[in-house]
Amino acid sequence: VLEVYYTSLRCRCVQESSVFIPRRFIDRIQILPRGNGCPRKEIIVWKKNKSIVCVDPQAEWIQRMMEVLRKRSSSTLPVPVFKRKIP
C-alpha cells in the first residue's frame, strides 16, 4: 500500500486535497520525502479508478491513516515500502 520514493525531480503536486478518501477506493499511496528538488513532503494517492490525487500531508485523515498503517506494520508483518528512483 505504501511506497516511498526518493527522486531528484521537482515537486509533483500543484494542488493538494484534504478530503478523506475511503481505503476501498485507494490502490496505493506514494510518499515523496522533501528535499532533492522539492522543499516539501508530498503524498500522492493512486486510486482504483485510475485517477491520482495529491493529499496535503497535514490533512488529519491521511495522518490518522498513516498512524493506523504504522501500528499495523509494527504489530504484524511490515508493510512493503518501495524505495526507488523515478527516472
Epitope: 478518501i21 475511503p22 482504483k48 490518522r64
Partner: antibody, heavy 120, light 107 residues
Framework: EVQLVQSGGGLVQPGGSLRLSCAAS????????MSWVRQAPGKGLEWVGE????????NYAPSLKDRFTISRDNAKNSLYLQMNSVRAEDTAVYYC?????????????WGQGTTVTVSS | DIQMTQSPSSLSASVGDRVTITCKAS??????VAWYQQKPGKAPKLLIY???YRYTGVPSRFSGSGSGTDFTFTISSVQPEDIATYYC?????????FGGGTKLEIK
C-alpha cells in the same frame, strides 16, 4: 443536469421477486460507483449495497446479501436491484444514489425513490 | 458493522437559533462521515462530506466537525426551510451505515 430516474416498484407478495431499475442521465455512468439505500415507512436510512463501475466489486449489507442482487448495464446507463424471497420487512422506499469516488466520496446524487410494498 | 449513534432523535428550535446534532461511531471512522438532509417525501441531499466540508451550493450556516468517533453537525441560524430530518453516515468502510436521524421542527 444529473438525473437518476427510478422504476419497478410496486406491490409484491411475500416470497416473490421484484427488479428495481435506476436510469442515469447527465453523468458518465460507467465511471461511477452506485449504491442502493432503502427507507422503511417512518424509519431511517439503511444502506443496501454498492457496485463499482465494471461490476467487479459488489458490496452488500450483510443481512441482505443472500436475497438481493445488485447489477448494472453501462451500455444502458442503468443500475438494477433484484429482490428475491421478499419479506414484509422489505417494504420501503428504495433509492439509488451515485457513490462518488472522484471528489466527495459520499452519495452526491439520488434518485426520486420507488416504493416497494410486500403484502399478501 | 460500525454503528452510528445520533442524538437527539428530535429537536425543536426557533428561527435564528443555533442547533447542534451529534453522531458517535462505534469505532474509529477517521473523517469518513457525511451529513444528509431529508425533507418529507423527498430523497436525501448531501450537505457535508469528509466530516467538515460543505457540498456544492450548501449554505454556510451548515457546518460539520469531528474525527475518529465523535462528530458534530451545526446549523448556526435555523431558517424555516431547514425543517427536515438530518442523518449522519459513515463511509469509512462497508457496510456503510447511517445514524438514526434527527427530526428538526420549528417552534
Amino acid at each position: 443536469e444529473v438525473q437518476l430516474v427510478q422504476s419497478g416498484g410496486g406491490l409484491v407478495q411475500p416470497g416473490g421477486s421484484l427488479r428495481l431499475s435506476c436510469a442515469a442521465s447527465g453523468i458518465d455512468f460507467s465511471r461511477y460507483w452506485m449504491s442502493w439505500v432503502r427507507q422503511a415507512p417512518g424509519k431511517g436510512l439503511e444502506w443496501v449495497g454498492e457496485i463499482n463501475p465494471d461490476s467487479s466489486t459488489i458490496n452488500y449489507a450483510p443481512s441482505l446479501k443472500d436475497r438481493f442482487t445488485i447489477s448494472r448495464d453501462n451500455a444502458k446507463n442503468s443500475l438494477y436491484l433484484q429482490m428475491n424471497s421478499v419479506r414484509a420487512e422489505d417494504t420501503a422506499v428504495y433509492y439509488c444514489a451515485r457513490q462518488d469516488d472522484y471528489e466527495y466520496y459520499a452519495m452526491d446524487y439520488w434518485g426520486q425513490g420507488t416504493t416497494v410494498t410486500v403484502s399478501s | 458493522d460500525i454503528q452510528m449513534t445520533q442524538s437527539p432523535s428530535s429537536l425543536s428550535a426557533s428561527v435564528g437559533d443555533r442547533v447542534t446534532i451529534t453522531c458517535k461511531a462505534s469505532q474509529d471512522v477517521n473523517t469518513g462521515v457525511a451529513w444528509y438532509q431529508q425533507k418529507p417525501g423527498k430523497a436525501p441531499k448531501l450537505l457535508i462530506y469528509s466530516a467538515s466540508y460543505r457540498y456544492t451550493g450548501v449554505p454556510s450556516r451548515f457546518s460539520g466537525s469531528g474525527s475518529g468517533t465523535d462528530f458534530t453537525f451545526t446549523i448556526s441560524s435555523v431558517q424555516p426551510e431547514d425543517i427536515a430530518t438530518y442523518y449522519c453516515q459513515q463511509y469509512y468502510s462497508t457496510p456503510l451505515t447511517f445514524g438514526g436521524g434527527t427530526k428538526l421542527e420549528i417552534k
